[in-house]
């Protein structure tokens, strides 16, 4: 159990990762491609993980304009690495129920990051939530 | 246990540049990110930036964007915060620290001083 | 950025005293708020992260509340080691920001 709430909490970190890379991005929001993207809001409990693919999935790009290119890319590059897999993602998948990626409403990259922030954060606030007190480490 | 060790105090002379190392051990170097935070004499805290030691991706503060760099050897499990141009204002204590949900972890400064 | 204000920048107590010390966002941080000690030539230590959670190792006696933009750290009985400085930091949006220090002294 210990090493299984330890392997939910670097998985957690990876998420809190996850949101400095997004905040990195909004830095560059105006080198980004202005196309519309899928971006879930108010996502019902349980299909918080079908969301995060949602915005993983998302065809985010650089405008390849400007000196920024690089590190747009390495960041959007980033934010679609496949994070390492847990009981929590795995029991989400066998969710038919959840809304396919085209259902959610299509925004604009600074809106679309935003979200995805917003996801991010309300993932880490759940898991921080259901443990009992003490460090990531303990 | 979870340990970071930095290098010595540091004399500089304004313009010149300097390189504080902070070596990790008692964990897992690459899973988590390293942040670098100053002190000034008497002053708070102030972050400067940080590094995924998997790929030596940065984030920098735009405070400090074009005279920072942060560097990782995964070898030897250690992390490098370069700082150029170097002014007397640059004079600080310069701590690494671990992040995971939080600075979980601190180095015990490197105290850098900038005098002509 | 985000700033941090904290309150209040000193104060005077005796062992066995109830200490409060607060942070202010200028704007809402959703509980991405934590709280660390600073001793004179000692590395800094985390006591508390996201808001109200112990880090490992950390005594009972400190805790975390708040919400939004208002937090709030208490030590419920200061203890002789726990003369120190303590700053709030959030970790809600880059850039990190902390808050300026409350040096806790004897009285």
């Known amino acids: 159990h210990k090493s299984s709430s330890q392997g939910q909490d670097r998985h957690m970190i990876r998420m809190r990762q996850l949101i400095d890379i997004v905040d990195q991005l909004k830095n560059y929001v105006n080198d980004l491609v202005p196309e519309f993207l899928p971006a879930p809001e108010d996502v019902e409990t349980n299909c918080e993980w079908s969301a995060f693919s949602c915005f993983q999935k998302a065809q985010l790009k650089s405008a390849n304009t400007g000196n920024n290119e690089r590190i747009i890319n390495v960041s959007i590059k980033k934010l679609k690495r496949k994070p390492p897999s847990t009981n929590a993602g795995r029991r989400q998948k066998h969710r038919l129920t959840c809304p396919s990626c085209d259902s959610y409403e299509k925004k604009p990259p600074k809106e679309f990051l935003e979200r995805f922030k917003s996801l991010l954060q309300k993932m880490i606030h759940q898991h921080l939530s259901s443990r009992t007190h003490g460090s990531e480490d303990s | 246990q979870v340990q970071l060790v930095q290098s010595g105090a540091e004399v500089k002379k304004p313009g010149a540049s300097v390189k504080v190392s902070c070596k990790a051990s008692g964990y897992t170097f690459t899973d988590y990110w390293m942040h670098w935070v100053r002190q000034a004499p008497g002053q708070g805290l102030e972050w400067m930036g940080t590094?995924?030691?998997?790929?030596?991706?940065?984030i920098y503060s735009q405070n400090f964007k074009g005279r920072v760099t942060m560097t990782r050897d995964t070898s030897t499990s250690t992390v490098y915060m370069e700082l150029s141009s170097l002014r007397s204002e640059d004079t600080a204590v310069y701590y690494c620290?671990?992040?995971?949900?939080?600075?979980?972890?601190w180095g015990q400064g490197t105290l850098v001083t900038v005098s002509s | 950025d985000i700033q941090l204000t904290q309150s209040p920048s000193s104060l005077s107590a005796s062992v066995g005293d109830r200490v409060t010390i607060t942070c202010r966002a200028s704007?809402?941080?959703?509980?991405?708020l934590n709280w660390y000690q600073q001793k004179p030539g000692k590395a800094v230590k985390l006591l508390i992260y996201y808001t109200s959670r112990l880090h490992s190792g950390v005594p009972s006696r400190f805790s975390g509340s708040g919400s939004g933009t208002d937090y709030t750290l208490t030590i419920s009985s200061l203890q002789p080691e726990d003369f120190a400085t303590y700053f709030c930091?959030?970790?809600?949006?880059?850039?990190?920001?902390f808050g300026g220090g409350t040096k806790v002294e004897i009285k």
């Open positions: 620290a671990r992040y995971g949900f939080a600075m979980d972890y």
């Open positions: 590094i995924d030691p998997s790929d030596n991706y940065t």
């Open positions: 704007q809402d941080i959703s509980n991405f």
């Open positions: 930091q959030q970790g809600h949006t880059l850039p990190r920001t």
